[in-house]
């Protein structure tokens, strides 16, 4: 059974992930971002279901494509290089979902824009955090 200290650690990691995802979304949605139109042409893939930490596997699998798209606006909108930002997220995701999980992500048929993709995972983090508090 999860202890209060492990729950607290999970909550802190989720809050960190949430802040990173929100930072990316804010950078993209920045009214000065001339790249938004181009960024919106890139397709992202969403999980059919995202209600548990193991479902973060679906986020992990889309982190490389996310990094590629962030490279398009690398110097203007983010404090960190996309590679470092994604690397940080990857570390948190691996810790949260557990590296020993063999969960196979199932993806929804419809694609998403980068904004929809980030919003989906922000909502996921918020939802899990609310169950922990």
């Amino acid at each position: 059974a999860p202890t209060s200290s492990s729950t607290k650690k999970t909550q802190l990691q989720l809050e960190h992930l949430l802040l990173d995802l929100q930072m990316i979304l804010n950078g993209i949605n920045n009214y000065k971002n001339p790249k938004l139109t181009r960024m919106l042409t890139f397709k992202f893939y969403m999980p059919k279901k995202a209600t548990e930490l193991k479902h973060l596997q679906c986020l992990e699998e889309e982190l490389k494509p996310l990094e590629e798209v962030l490279n398009l606006a690398q110097s203007k909108n983010f404090h960190l290089r996309p590679r470092d930002l994604i690397s940080n997220i990857n570390v948190i995701v691996l810790e949260l979902k557990g590296s020993e999980t063999t969960f196979m992500c199932e993806y929804a048929d419809e694609t998403a824009t980068i904004v929809e993709f980030l919003n989906r995972w922000i909502t996921f983090c918020q939802s899990i955090i609310s169950t922990l508090t």
């Epitope: 490389k64 990094e67 110097s75 992500c105 993806y107």
Partner: antibody, heavy 121, light 113 residues
């Protein structure tokens, strides 16, 4: 149709710089990234970097960081690749290229004819 | 960076025979979200720029003869020329088109036996 036309061959001295141009036609240069790829004589292909002509954003291969500068002039639909501190190993054909479509960054479907740069003392 | 290992270095095939070129990547090129492998194949003839033949591992580029086909997934890929023609003499390269920097294989020279 999409066409990328590059400037002519160049002979340069070691330590100098070279600037190669790539004129785009058949589409708006701001629609997509322009990549640069080089090929040394009898060797393979090596990606150097890309530029987004829309705003001048660049992404360089680590190997060329600090020595290559990619620029673009949207008024003339031309992209440029400048390589400085030339050495003999930079003797190569330099290509500009555009991706297959603008829904992903790679692969390269449209290529310039290539510009031979010879570095020799 | 992803390393692309191509084999063989060169290949001599009789006209009308099958030619097979392999390419192995150091990391998976499969994007599970769309089940696409981000691998492309190019043909290059002397004095010419490379020409895109296949992308997404198995999709033929428009205008490319259907004797050229691509297969494979994950880290192992193959380009097949089902019936070699004289105009197919060239160097063939694979390219991983998934992650920056994009990286090419060293090339396979195809000749007529």
């Amino acid at each position: 149709q999409v066409q990328l036309v590059q400037s002519g061959a160049e002979v340069k001295k070691p330590g100098s710089s070279v600037k190669v141009s790539c004129k785009a036609s058949g589409y708006s240069i701001t629609d997509d990234l322009i990549h640069w790829v080089r090929q040394a004589p009898g060797q393979g292909l090596e990606w150097m970097g890309w530029i987004d002509p829309e705003d001048g954003e660049t992404n360089y291969a680590q190997k060329f960081q600090g020595r290559v500068t990619l620029t673009a002039d949207t008024s003339t639909s031309t992209a440029y690749m400048e390589l400085s501190s030339l050495r003999s190993e930079d003797t190569a054909v330099y290509y500009c290229a555009r991706s297959l479509d603008s829904t992903w960054i790679y692969p390269f479907a449209y290529w310039g004819q290539g510009t031979l740069v010879t570095v020799s003392s | 960076d992803i390393v692309m290992t191509q084999s063989p270095d060169s290949l001599a095939v009789s006209l009308g025979e099958r030619a097979t070129i392999n390419c192995k990547s150091s990391q998976s090129l499969l994007r599970r979200g769309n089940q696409k492998n981000h691998l492309a194949w190019y043909q290059q003839k002397p004095g010419q720029p490379p020409k895109l033949l296949i992308y997404d591992a198995s999709t033929g580029q428009s205008g490319v003869p259907d004797r050229f086909s691509g297969s494979g997934s994950g880290t192992d890929f193959t380009l097949t020329i089902s019936s070699l023609q004289a105009e197919d003499v060239a160097v063939y390269y694979c390219l991983q088109s998934y992650i920056t920097p994009p990286t090419f294989g060293a090339g396979t020279k195809v000749e007529i036996k």
